[in-house]
Interface confidence: low
């Protein structure tokens, strides 16, 4: 539909500041929360997010569609994404929220349908985790921890 | 099917694996490099990226346009981004590469022109840094370091 896309709601040239609606869990990893947080706080935040994910319908969401009713960038994107839980028992935190692109293509801004001539790709970032390094069996020494950076998808973008 | 934009180069239904061309600095923070890296390696990688940024034309790039010649996702995106250097002398690393959206709107996939009825927004992630915490003047005690998580833009996505 050759027409300026669907962000222009009546009397509104472009979306205003996105603010959470009622009953909406702030799962949006895109929003800039605080400029920085302590490590302990960061790990606590991750645990909270994982808990929120488990309690929300977010994990079940597999639909390639844009939702203009929601304030979160991840659901308003042309390359929308949801979150899955990246689980690894040999890591602290064991569970990490990871972005998962909901479309192979991108949402065509005119038809609001998936368009496979573009491609949704993850935007990766490196996050700090602690790896449990245990000696191979039969275990003789204790497990050690090493701080490492793990690559994780934090969002999706639409490319040609 | 809403088929669209200009990704369909001759004989190519969708972009293949993106691989760097000659003389191209792999500045793409979107690509998944290694699953994980040690902290020291991570800090070294950041220093290398900052050095590459300083030596490339990347910092001067301010144009809202898609470049299909380049392999990097950040230049092929409907919400293209470049990198700036986030400089903070009270932090280690002092310099962090930060994504900067090149468009206020997004690139319209039909016209390849900027379309202000959509909006480019940063995708944020939290990265580990060490903060130098020094007592206020007159300084009596030594400066300490605290590991904190700093929020930084790692890419951009296009929203309605």
């Amino acid at each position: 539909q050759p027409r300026s896309p669907k962000s222009k709601r009546k009397g509104q040239g472009r979306p205003g500041p996105l603010a959470p609606g009622p009953h909406q869990v702030p799962l949006d990893l895109v929003s800039r929360m605080k400029p920085y947080a302590r490590m302990e706080e960061y790990e606590r935040n991750i645990e909270e997010m994982v808990a929120q994910l488990r309690n929300s319908s977010e994990l079940a969401q597999r639909k390639c569609e844009v939702n203009l009713q929601l304030w979160m960038s991840n659901k308003r994107s042309l390359s929308p994404w949801g979150y899955s839980i990246n689980h690894d028992p040999s890591r602290i935190p064991v569970d990490l929220p990871e972005a998962r692109c909901l479309c192979l293509g991108c949402v065509n801004p005119f038809t609001m349908q998936e368009d496979r001539s573009m491609v949704s790709v993850p935007v990766f970032s490196q996050v700090p985790v602690r790896r449990r390094l245990c000696p191979p069996p039969p275990r003789t020494g204790p497990c050690r921890q090493r701080a490492v950076m793990e690559t994780i998808a934090v969002g999706c973008t639409c490319i040609f | 099917q809403p088929r669209s934009p200009k990704s369909k180069r001759k004989g190519q239904g969708r972009p293949g694996p993106l691989a760097p061309g000659p003389h191209q600095v792999p500045l793409d923070l979107v690509s998944r490099m290694k699953p994980y890296a040690r902290m020291e390696e991570y800090e070294r990688n950041i220093e290398e990226m900052v050095a590459q940024l300083r030596n490339s034309s990347e910092l001067a790039q301010r144009k809202c346009e898609v470049n299909l010649q380049l392999w990097m996702s950040n230049k092929r995106s409907l919400s293209p981004w470049g990198y700036s250097i986030n400089h903070d002398p009270s932090r280690i690393p002092v310099d962090l590469p930060e994504a900067r959206c090149l468009c206020l709107g997004c690139v319209n996939p039909f016209t390849m022109q900027e379309d202000r009825s959509m909006v480019s927004v940063p995708v944020f992630s939290q990265v580990p840094v060490r903060r130098r915490l020094c007592p206020p003047p007159p300084r009596t005690g030594p400066c300490r370091q605290r590991a904190v998580m700093e929020t930084i833009a790692v890419g951009c996505t296009c929203i309605f």
């Epitope: 050759p2 027409r3 001539s117 | 039909f110």
Partner: antibody, heavy 119, light 112 residues
Amino acid sequence: QVQLQQSGPELVKPGASVKISCKASGYTFTDYFINWVRQRPGQGLEWIGWIFPGSGSTYYHEKFKGKATLTVDKSSSTAYMLLSSLTSEDSAVYFCARTLYGNWYFDVWGTGTTVTVSS
Amino acid sequence: DVLMTQTPLSLPVSLGDQASISCRSSQSIVHSNGNTYLEWYLQKPGQSPKLLIYKVSNRFSGVPDRFSGSGSGTDFTLKISRVEAEDLGVYYCFQGSHVPYTFGGGTKLEIK
């Protein structure tokens, strides 16, 4: 002046295919969408789909998927519609019409091509 | 699909009379961007359709000012203040707000 010149009438057998053309002149072909519209004898107008010549991108009305295939030849500023597996139901006048991105209206229409499906 | 229903099917008028054609959509055709892509076209016998009105009430260039469009949401009207002989033909409304785009069934304006 701006014109969309369509190919002449076609008489085709059931089950066959036909490719009709729409040649644009007087404007930059790659800047406008080309739409196709069907009009059965004594009936109203039905939108089939569009193609954007700048990129070759297409969008079809669900009803016409598999029936119509839209293509363009930028070098000759010509849009084509291939109609396949024809039946008597496909007998109609087919129009092309252009629209500019950001507007929607069909400001220029083609002359129309009559397709008759008969054995 | 959005169903566009035009009334009347046939409209007999005398030259110089006012004519009014109604078009009703099965759902709101206000696009999410705030625009309403409702057009009116006139098709004379043996000819291609011609654009008269776009976005509900905007007259296309060269269209006489006796033609006017109005309405909102789901109800739209085309008015011809003083019908002339050259106005005779079939009038179609069209919505371009939701895919698939759809035309009304047409209203035939004829001489009484």
